[in-house]
């Protein structure tokens, strides 16, 4: 009764166990009784990632700079190119095939997280006491000025866009006339 | 240090049903195929059965078809062998042994060999 | 199944000697061959992989050749605690088999 299974390194072809080519590497031939399973090195701009038994390597990925993208990592014989984006863009899927600008935070919102090559742009509303009044995608919302460390009072109240505005604080309050 | 210990083994009616364990320690258990191979008192080695290292491939010699089971949980770094419908031949050490794939990239094919042996458990089948 | 017969079943050498052990396989292996030593009371182990590689912490006397259906080990020198037995096996195909084994007895 012939072999239905073999070991992690081999696969079954004609009721025998061949040995897999190594990553890197393509299947040029089977083995027989008598002779190893054959096998070629990639070509350059190819690979192969995993113990296979394929007869042509995979093409390394193309990272179309008109596409907004850039090498990350150069591919070797084992391993597929890597591509990331240009600075100031990020990838819109996990295989980084196309890139998009980052998001800029409007006024009203500051940087929760800044965008990096893989993800965009992370927004947050300014809460009460913070503000943010540009449009930017580094900005964090920023506390409002605290008017009573400089010795002022408030004149104008913050707001998530805008910051108090402080003024000196009224004399009358503190000098009381007495006729 | 690595390591693999047996247990289990012991005194069975015919008929009866037993199983092994095989403990490992002091490496990746779950990144290696395993086998179990048994010695009849004062025979020779018989290779019983192989599993891979996920657990979803399974062989076994024709002496033991349909009997035994082979199995692994990798979470508890532990290989099982049921052992059922047993016969006064199944009477022997079962040693649980590690197949480790030999490779040099500068070669152009690897090699299988069994690098780590249990120290062995007896298993007895008489009336 | 690929029988392995194994020859001689039992031989007789003084420390110093040469000895060669052959296995011979019913159909071709190519170099999927390992040979192992034992002791009694002991586990098996692991000589000789891939026919002629010498695993790790094996004293260089042991060495292994030959591929498809004929192979051989030899022990240049013996020592004294090469006196065991020992076997091949053929990882090529389901069902892997050993060889029937050959003592090495002290003469």
């Known amino acids: 009764e012939p072999p239905t299974a073999c070991r992690e390194k081999q696969y079954l072809i004609n009721s025998q166990c061949c040995s897999l080519c190594q990553p890197g590497q393509k299947l040029v031939s089977d083995c027989t009784e008598f002779t190893e399973t054959e096998c070629l090195p990639c070509g350059e701009s190819e690979f192969l990632d995993t113990w296979n038994r394929e007869t042509h390597c995979h093409q390394h990925k193309y990272c179309d700079p008109n596409l907004g993208l850039r090498v990350q990592q150069k591919g070797t014989s084992e391993t597929d190119t890597i591509c990331t984006c240009e600075e100031g863009w990020h990838c819109t899927s996990e295989a980084c095939e196309s890139c998009v600008l980052h998001r800029s935070c409007s006024p009203g919102f500051g940087v929760k997280q800044i965008a990096t090559g893989v993800s965009d742009t992370i927004c947050e509303p300014c809460p009460v006491g913070f503000f943010s009044n540009v449009s930017s995608a580094f900005e964090k919302c920023h506390p409002w000025t605290s008017c009573e460390t400089k010795d002022l009072v408030v004149q104008q109240a913050g707001t998530n866009k805008t910051d108090v505005v402080c003024g000196p604080q009224d004399r009358l309050r503190h000098h009381h006339h007495h006729h | 240090e690595v390591q693999l210990l047996e247990s289990g083994g012991g005194l069975v009616r015919p008929g009866g049903s037993l199983r092994l364990s095989c403990a490992a320690s002091?490496?990746?258990?779950?990144?290696?195929?395993m086998d179990w191979v048994r010695q009849a008192p004062g025979k020779g080695l018989e290779w019983v059965s192989y599993i891979s290292s996920s657990g979803e491939t399974t062989d076994y010699a024709d002496s033991v078809k349909p009997r035994f089971t082979v199995s692994r949980d990798n979470s508890k770094n532990l290989l099982y062998l049921q052992m059922n419908s047993l016969r006064a031949e199944d009477t022997a050490v079962y040693y649980c042994a590690r197949d480790v794939f030999f490779f040099d990239s500068s070669g152009d094919n690897g090699a299988y060999g069994m690098d780590v042996w249990g120290q062995g458990t007896m298993v007895t089948v008489s009336s | 199944d690929i029988q392995l017969t194994q020859s001689p079943s039992s031989l007789t050498a003084s420390v110093g000697d040469r000895v060669t052990i052959t296995c011979r396989s019913s159909q071709g292996i190519r170099s999927s061959l390992a040979w192992y030593q034992q002791k009694p009371g002991k586990p098996p182990k692991l000589l000789i992989y891939?026919?002629?590689s010498l695993e790790g912490g094996v004293p260089s006397r042991f060495s292994g050749s030959g591929s498809g259906t004929d192979f051989t080990l030899t022990i240049s020198s013996l020592q004294p605690e090469d006196f065991a037995t020992y076997y091949c096996q053929q990882l090529n195909s389901f069902p892997s088999t050993f060889g029937q084994g050959t003592k090495l007895e002290i003469k």
């Open positions: 891939g026919g002629s």
């Open positions: 002091g490496f990746t258990f779950g990144s290696y195929e």
